[in-house]
Interface confidence: medium
């Protein structure tokens, strides 16, 4: 099934995905008994329900959420099948054969969070996380339909030449892993805190001093590959002084559509 379940919006008895699901939640929805997509569905549910016994996606579903949306329906095209509405986003159902994806979003007005739907999926038993860095957007409390905006994804790779890769970077539970992940996440919030940056995901560490790979998300049209790389390179000096990270061999590329992410070991907030 690919039809998105519609929920209405406000507070939340149970607003998160079922265990094993890779769908992170949206918040603040009102009413709907049980509108989960069928198992295997990629339909985006909205979450955060007041009178809803269970609006979680079924186990194994990769459905991301809808937040704070005012009403829109149609098809979208762009560098990925994620659409941003009123500063929020809803992911369209993914159709690998096409860049134009149908979507349908429930109409409601709410003061609940604006967030970007995650693409993260799990890689292994220790990394079943739908990680979380906030978008820089804020709610648009208009109740009229708004133009949908696409999301552009960029794959970024760089070396930290003053660190040595060791087994701790293969284990998300180690302090070393978590502190490096935390510093890198914070660093990107500082680098791209001006306009358009929606978040990052899928941090991975690889051997070779330490090779860091991750995916960045921006509102479509706000930045290109060259600017992503330029802004990152301009931060190298501060990265060295502030985080003691000596960065080299920076590489940025567009993420081809459709975006299929293998999650690193981030966790939600």
């Amino acid at each position: 099934s690919t039809a998105p379940p519609a929920h209405g919006v406000t507070s939340a008895p149970d607003t998160r995905p079922a265990p094993g699901s890779t769908a992170p939640p949206a918040h603040g929805v009102t009413s709907a008994p049980d509108t989960r997509p069928a198992p295997g569905s990629t339909a985006p549910p909205a979450h955060g329900v007041t009178s809803a016994p269970d609006n979680r996606p079924a186990l194994g579903s990769t459905a991301p959420p809808v937040h704070n949306v005012t009403s829109a329906s149609g098809s979208a095209s762009g560098s990925a099948s994620t659409l941003v509405h009123n500063g929020t986003s809803a992911r369209a159902t993914t159709t690998p054969a096409s860049k134009s994806t149908p979507f349908s979003i429930p109409s409601h007005h709410s003061d609940t969070p604006t967030t970007l739907a995650s693409h993260s999926t799990k890689t292994d038993a220790s990394s079943t996380h739908h990680s979380s860095v906030p978008p820089l957007t804020s709610s648009n409390h208009s109740t009229s339909p708004q133009l949908s905006t696409g999301v552009s994804f960029f794959f970024l790779s760089f070396h930290i030449s003053n660190l040595q890769f060791n087994s701790s970077l293969e284990d998300p539970s180690t302090d070393y892993y978590q502190e490096l992940q935390r510093d890198i996440s914070e660093m990107f919030l500082q680098i791209y805190k001006q306009g358009g940056f929606l978040g990052l995901s899928n941090i991975k560490f690889r051997p070779g001093s330490v090779v860091v790979q991750l995916t960045l998300a921006f509102r479509e049209g706000t930045i290109n590959v060259h600017d992503v790389e330029t802004q990152f390179n301009q931060y190298k000096t501060e990265a060295a002084s502030r985080y003691n990270l000596t960065i080299s061999d920076v590489s940025v590329s567009d993420v081809p559509f459709p975006f299929s992410a293998q999650s690193g070991a981030g966790v939600p907030g």
Partner: antibody, heavy 127, light 107 residues
């Protein structure tokens, strides 16, 4: 309804230990990062620790690092704070809180805010 | 760590008046700032997240604004139940930090 019910406070001597518990109900506990925040008498709020939904990632304030351990038992819908080597300055009301989740990205401490709080439990460290 | 300074420390107003609370960060926190309300003997309550977004169930008289280093919480018309202590909190940089609080008391 969504609620967090705390227990485990008390009066202990410096150097001793206390374990705080926070029982969650009304939501899928295993899907939320959880925090501990404390408030010394007559003072403001101080963030203490956070744990990811699956219990893997944990972060601590420098003031408690190495002495406090945050943990969770998702099968029991319960969050814990084990406090060892307690000092007088650890005396406070301790609150557990649920993180209003964000969606895209990494690292659990980037959250929108703490949207559900326990009622608080008092830990007093005194000789 | 980022230091959040709230002002004034105490605000004495009457019901129906407008309250304006300030929170200043020692360095930019972009829009990553939340506001909480705390009444005596109670846990804090999330009012505003990310500078300007009202949390679920928060009345429209509460509004937040600002970005970078200067933020404002405005209560357009004080209700009797609004007299409390208000805290700001940033999540831009590690560790998360709170302001020292502003007490809104009845004049």
């Amino acid at each position: 309804q969504v609620q967090l019910v705390q227990s485990g406070g008390g009066v202990v001597q410096p150097g001793r230990s206390l374990r705080l518990s926070c029982a969650a109900s009304g939501f899928t506990f295993s899907s939320y990062a959880m925090h501990w925040v404390r408030q010394a008498p007559g003072k403001g709020l101080e963030w203490v620790a956070v744990i990811s939904d699956d219990g893997i990632n944990k972060y601590y304030a420098d003031s408690v690092k190495g002495r406090f351990t945050i943990s969770r038992d998702n099968s029991k819908n319960t969050l814990y704070l084990q406090m060892n080597s307690l000092r007088a300055e650890d005396s406070a009301v301790y609150y557990c809180a649920r993180a209003l989740p964000t969606i895209f990205g990494v690292v659990m401490y980037f959250y929108y805010g703490l949207d559900v709080w326990g009622q608080g439990t008092t830990a007093t460290v005194s000789s | 760590e980022i230091v959040l300074t709230q002002s004034p420390a105490t605000l004495s107003l009457s019901p129906g008046e407008r309250a304006t609370l300030s929170c200043r960060a020692s360095q930019s926190v972009s829009s990553y700032l939340a506001w909480y309300q705390q009444k005596p003997g109670q846990a804090p309550r999330l009012l505003i997240y990310d500078a300007s977004n009202r949390a679920t169930g928060i009345p429209a008289r509460f509004s937040g604004s600002g970005s970078g280093t200067d933020f404002t919480l405005t209560i357009s018309s004080l209700e009797p139940e609004d007299f409390a202590v208000y805290y700001c909190q940033q999540r831009s940089n590690w560790p998360p930090t709170f302001g020292q609080g502003t007490k809104v008391e009845i004049k």
